[in-house]
């Protein structure tokens, strides 16, 4: 007695898909494997699969049931923080080959990485054009205050909404102030912030408010101290320069706003006589420490001049050091002062129409705005490479 | 809390044009694409037309392509329906509704008769 | 387009019972990871309230007592115990691609 195992079905291809080996007949042993087109990959029920092959059964069955070829689908994209994703293709498609378009919150915030275009591929991410799969950033734009120029001189101004939206009023043990970098980092004087080196948290930080003792402001808090290893306390103040990292993003708007660092270009915009413009809550002529946000347009000193007025007693030779630069007027009268220690000294750079820090409020002569004598600032173009580490290693 | 409040509709006679606007509050209304919604009376819902978040694309029913326009202001956070050369058709309760992959939320309604 | 067939188009039930809704598409409205197939109720001069998203998804805020179900072609909408508040007409909802389509309904009343 002999019998011949029953060929099995053709069979038929799930839409989308091929079977490979294509045969007249399957019979017993005989098998084929679904290969799914790109775009699309293999179900069984739920389930995805790897890869599909059946095996023609003696009974004429195949030993598994036929798999679907569905279409890859890349799931809702991540949320871009500070901006927002737009459906291209279809609302809410995001199935293979559709297309999203990222960006960022208009006027506050500008796109890093790339285009913020992506598209769904075969491997279920989405895919920048450039072929990333991570999600471009939104960097605050720096530098955008509501005021203009610097232009001529004046003095003990009081600041209005918008004019220095990157202060910081630091408060811990001192008055002090900072700027705030991108969204997450304050830039300060060491001296300012030594004492709290290793106590981060004690420091109150505040910002996009106008007054120094209002209710209304927003609170930052500090994750960490960075203070530049070349600073040594109560010994000069070469390398007065610290990072403060927030211990969380704050929310850029037209109060809030970061300041730009210096571009190599920059010095071309600190020559001698160029006006810079210090703002903070420090002491004013009346002695006491600012209630309303004060600022200040002030000239570059001449650094031989400069060095040469800091040499005689009680200053200690070497004081002024070539990370140092000085602003202020020969006949006195214009200055930063005690409290402003650790604020920006910032210029507007008049080919990208941003502001952008030159200096930070360091240390001078006893009595502020003295003739004869210049307000001290760390010269901040000699630390990018410092602040740059600093940043994109925490 | 989440809302959207239609306006705009009334009694309009056909071939005239109409605009509805829906104002959004409690979310960050540039997040979400939008959406209007219709029910004509005693029928079931159809979908009219979708804006993404920023406006970069938009889509619509073959019924209303080239006579409807939707368009939205972020800054006012309103979304609009310009309706020209309505149709007796065109009668219906429209809805405004949030949501790139569903209508998640909608607003009451207002209502559009056009009627000679 | 595609095309959203719900049966029953109108379905008689008491307080307690189970009730089951079912929807056809057209076409597949289902890839690797989702169905984009949604439920919604609503009740007379209200604007409808979606109760159920992906298929199987429960909306915040809406009773347990709501499941749903299926994918491909077939989906269906199931309240294992019916309350009063539940009368209302159901519709389902693709989101598969424009435009996106409705049911004609299930007008659920009391028995």
């Known amino acids: 007695y002999t019998s011949t195992a029953q060929p099995c079905p053709y069979p038929m291809a799930p839409p989308n898909g091929h079977v490979s080996p294509v045969q007249a007949k399957y019979i017993l042993k005989d098998s084929f494997s679904i290969f799914c087109e790109t775009g699309y990959e293999l179900l069984q029920g739920h389930l995805p699969l790897k890869s599909f092959t059946a095996v023609c059964q003696k009974d004429g069955s195949w030993d598994r049931p036929m798999p679907a070829c569905s279409i890859v689908d890349c799931g809702p994209p991540d949320d871009l923080p500070s901006g927002r994703v737009e459906y291209i293709t279809g609302p809410g498609v995001t199935t293979y080959k559709a297309v999203i378009q990222y960006s960022c919150e208009e006027t506050f915030y500008t796109m890093k990485v790339n285009d913020g275009k992506y598209v769904c591929e075969a491997d279920g991410f989405w895919t920048s054009s450039k072929g990333e799969k991570s999600l471009p950033v939104c960097e605050p734009v720096c530098g955008l205050s509501a005021r203009t120029t610097g232009g001529r001189i004046y003095g003990g101004q009081k600041a209005k909404p918008g004019d220095f939206p990157w202060q910081v009023l630091i408060l811990g043990g001192t008055t002090a102030a900072g700027a705030l970098l991108y969204d997450n980092w304050v830039l300060t004087a060491a001296h300012a912030v030594y004492e709290q080196k290793h106590d981060a948290s004690a420091l109150d930080i505040r910002m996009g408010t106008l007054k120094r003792l209002s209710p209304h402001y927003t609170q930052a808090w500090s994750e960490a101290v960075f203070i530049h290893e070349g600073y040594t306390h109560d010994a000069g103040f070469d390398n007065d320069i610290a990072l403060i990292k927030l211990n969380n993003k704050v929310v850029i708007n037209s109060n809030i706003t970061p300041i730009c660092l210096p571009r190599k270009e920059a010095e071309s915009f600190m020559r001698t006589d160029d006006i810079g413009t210090a703002s903070g809550w420090g002491l004013t002529q009346r002695g006491f420490l600012a209630r309303n946000l004060m600022y200040v347009d002030i000239p570059i000193v001449d650094h031989q001049k400069c060095t040469a007025a800091y040499e005689k007693p009680p200053y200690p030779r070497g004081s002024v050091t070539a990370n140092m630069l000085c602003a202020g007027l020969e006949s006195g009268g214009k200055d930063s002062c005690r409290g402003d220690s650790g604020g920006a000294l910032v210029f507007l750079d008049s080919e990208t129409e941003r502001w952008f820090v030159g200096g930070i409020v360091s240390w001078g002569s006893m009595n502020c705005g003295e003739a004869g004598q210049y307000g001290v600032y760390t010269k901040v173009i000699n630390y990018i490479p410092w602040i740059e580490n600093i940043i994109s290693d925490f | 809390q989440v809302q959207l409040v239609e306006s705009g509709g009334g009694v309009v006679q056909p071939g005239r044009s109409l605009r509805l606007s829906c104002a959004a509050s409690g979310f960050t209304f540039s997040s979400f694409g939008m959406h209007w919604v219709r029910q004509a009376p005693g029928k079931g819902l159809e979908w009219v037309a979708y804006i993404s978040s920023g406006s970069s694309s938009s889509f619509y029913v073959d019924t209303v392509k080239g006579r409807f326009t939707i368009s939205r202001d972020n800054s006012k956070n309103t979304l609009y329906l310009q309706m020209n050369s309505l149709r007796a058709e065109d009668t219906a309760v429209y809805y405004c509704?949030?949501?790139?992959?569903?209508?998640?939320?909608w607003g009451q309604g207002t209502t559009v008769t056009v009627s000679s | 387009d595609i095309q959203m067939t719900q049966s029953p188009s109108s379905l008689s039930a008491s307080v307690g019972d189970r009730v089951t809704i079912t929807c056809r598409a057209s076409q597949s409205v289902s890839s690797s990871r989702y169905s984009y197939m949604h439920w919604f109720q609503q009740k007379p001069g209200k604007a409808p309230k979606l109760l159920i998203y992906h298929a199987s998804n429960l909306e915040s805020g809406v009773p347990s007592r709501f499941s749903g179900s299926g994918s491909g072609t077939d989906f269906t909408l199931t309240i294992s115990s019916l309350q009063p508040e539940d009368f209302a007409t159901y519709y389902c909802?693709?989101?598969?691609?424009?435009?996106?389509?409705f049911g004609q309904g299930t007008k659920l009343e009391i028995k």
């Open positions: 909802q693709q989101s598969w691609e424009v435009p996106w389509t």
């Open positions: 509704a949030r949501g790139d992959r569903n209508f998640e939320v």
